[in-house]
Interface confidence: low
């Protein structure tokens, strides 16, 4: 029994509804009450869902799937995923059992995007060229973890004394934490560009310190 | 209703092969997961593996070497066959069915007991 | 491998009084699902085990409310209340976390 998955995997954004699809083709002649469908994490074996004897034996994860009964008996074996959590994410399979039996696994990509970062300065006041000053750009809230670029105003790359820190929170969403210490110029723009690599999705956040002029005794 | 009903020699004399059969009724070995459990004399329960409903099989690391989980799906079997057996393998052998709501242990089989003597 | 722990070989009560039985993981059994994979067992003198609990709180079908089950990541508790003869025999607790599967040594439940 050929059973269809997608190659790539699912997308979903954190606390929206995903649906992993699978699909088979049925002989004619085919009753659901021939049917047995599971849906479990592959690596673990846990059950997530099932359709055994004519019956939707339900959500067996958090109460949180559901199939697509009217469609079953036409082969879609898909399964819907309510309010995705990061610890959804990995490989699902479904496994498709008639007269024959089949199975194929699809992944499920969890993802969430980084807030605008805020950006502030230590220290903050009386700045002066040639001071040396630590900016912090802060984003939160994303997942998987984020890549952190920081340039000048002219768009050259800062690469050096950036230091980057991401911590999971109990949802398993990341704040993004990056510090750049540098030395004053006459005047100078600061950017820290925090990059979702799964959405590919870019925040942006940049200050802007005038330096006062220097004045000699 | 599912029933498991299991077979094989109680007794099997050392380094020999430990071969058991849990036959299943009311229910298809194609669906769900067929685990085997053994219980030694003083109530230890030790899980040693399974066989999925697509065949594929896992095994206990400390049984790794010498286990292996089978099963004919025309009649509906599951197969425990443990090799090079010692008088530590002394144990009542359980057949369980991984259930659909439960994810293990809804049905058992009514246990073998087995002695590895000469 | 989770070891599972029941410290207590065996627990008498009085028929008609309660009796709680402990377990204990050596690693929480919270999935980040939500679902605690720690079930209980009961295999009553010349039987099969047979499934009460599962998935730490849930009652399997058939078993009386007089079973429950509760605990946190890594502390359970099986309590019976209304202890009846036929409640006797070794009760095992056992997680579903990870592989291989493994159960407590077991309590033996004696009546008085």
């Known amino acids: 029994l050929e059973v269809q998955v997608p190659e790539d995997p699912v997308v979903a954004l954190v606390g929206t509804d995903a649906t992993l699809c699978c699909s088979f083709s049925p002989e004619p002649g085919f009753s659901l009450a021939q049917l047995n469908l599971i849906w479990q994490l592959t690596d673990t074996k846990q059950l997530v869902h099932s359709f055994a004897e004519g019956q939707d034996q339900g959500s067996a994860y958090a109460n949180r799937t559901a199939l697509f009964p009217d469609l079953l008996a036409q082969g879609n074996a898909s399964l819907r995923l309510q309010r995705v959590r990061v610890a959804d994410e990995g490989s699902f399979t479904c496994f498709v059992s008639i007269r024959d039996f089949g199975s194929a696994a699809v992944s499920l990509q969890v993802a969430a995007p980084y807030s605008k970062p805020s950006m502030t300065l230590e220290p903050n006041k009386d700045l002066r060229p040639g001071d040396t000053v630590t900016i912090t750009c802060s984003s939160y809230r994303g997942y998987p973890e984020a890549e952190v670029f920081w340039q000048d105003g002219q768009g050259v790359p800062l690469t050096g004394n950036v230091t980057t820190s991401q911590m999971a929170n109990e949802q398993g969403l990341f704040d993004v934490h990056s510090v750049l210490r540098v030395v004053l110029g006459a005047n100078g723009t600061y950017s820290c560009l925090v990059r979702n690599p799964v959405l590919q999705q870019d925040a942006h956040g940049s200050v802007t310190i005038t330096g006062q002029p220097m004045t000699f005794p | 209703e599912v029933q498991l009903q299991q077979s094989g020699p109680s007794l099997v004399k050392p380094s020999q092969t430990l071969s058991l059969t849990c036959s299943v009724t009311?229910?298809?070995?194609?669906?769900?997961?067929w685990n085997w459990i053994r219980k030694f004399p003083g109530n230890k329960l030790e899980y040693m593996g399974y066989i999925s409903s697509s065949g594929s099989t896992y095994y206990n690391p400390s049984l790794k070497s010498r286990i292996s989980i089978t099963r004919d799906t025309s009649k509906n079997q599951s197969y425990l066959q443990l090799n090079s057996v010692t008088a530590e393998d002394t144990a009542t052998y359980y057949c369980?069915?991984?259930?659909?709501?439960?994810?293990?242990?809804?049905?058992w089989g009514q246990g073998t007991s087995v002695t590895v003597s000469s | 491998d989770i070891v599972m722990t029941q410290s207590a070989p065996s627990v008498p009560v009085t028929p008609g009084e309660s009796v709680s039985i402990s377990c204990r993981s050596s690693k929480s059994l919270l999935h980040s699902n939500g679902n605690t994979y720690l079930y209980w067992f009961l295999q009553r003198p010349g039987q099969s085990p047979q499934l009460l609990i599962y998935r730490m709180s849930n009652l399997a079908s058939g078993v009386p409310d007089r079973f429950s089950g509760s605990g946190s990541g890594t502390a359970f508790t099986l309590r019976i209340s209304r202890v009846e003869a036929e409640d006797v025999g070794v009760y095992y607790c056992?997680?579903?976390?990870?592989?291989?599967?493994?159960f407590g040594a077991g309590t033996k439940l004696e009546l008085k």
């Open positions: 009311g229910g298809s070995i194609t669906s769900f997961y």
């Open positions: 369980a069915r991984g259930g659909v709501h439960y994810g293990f242990g809804d049905y």
């Open positions: 056992m997680q579903h976390l990870e592989y291989p599967l493994t």
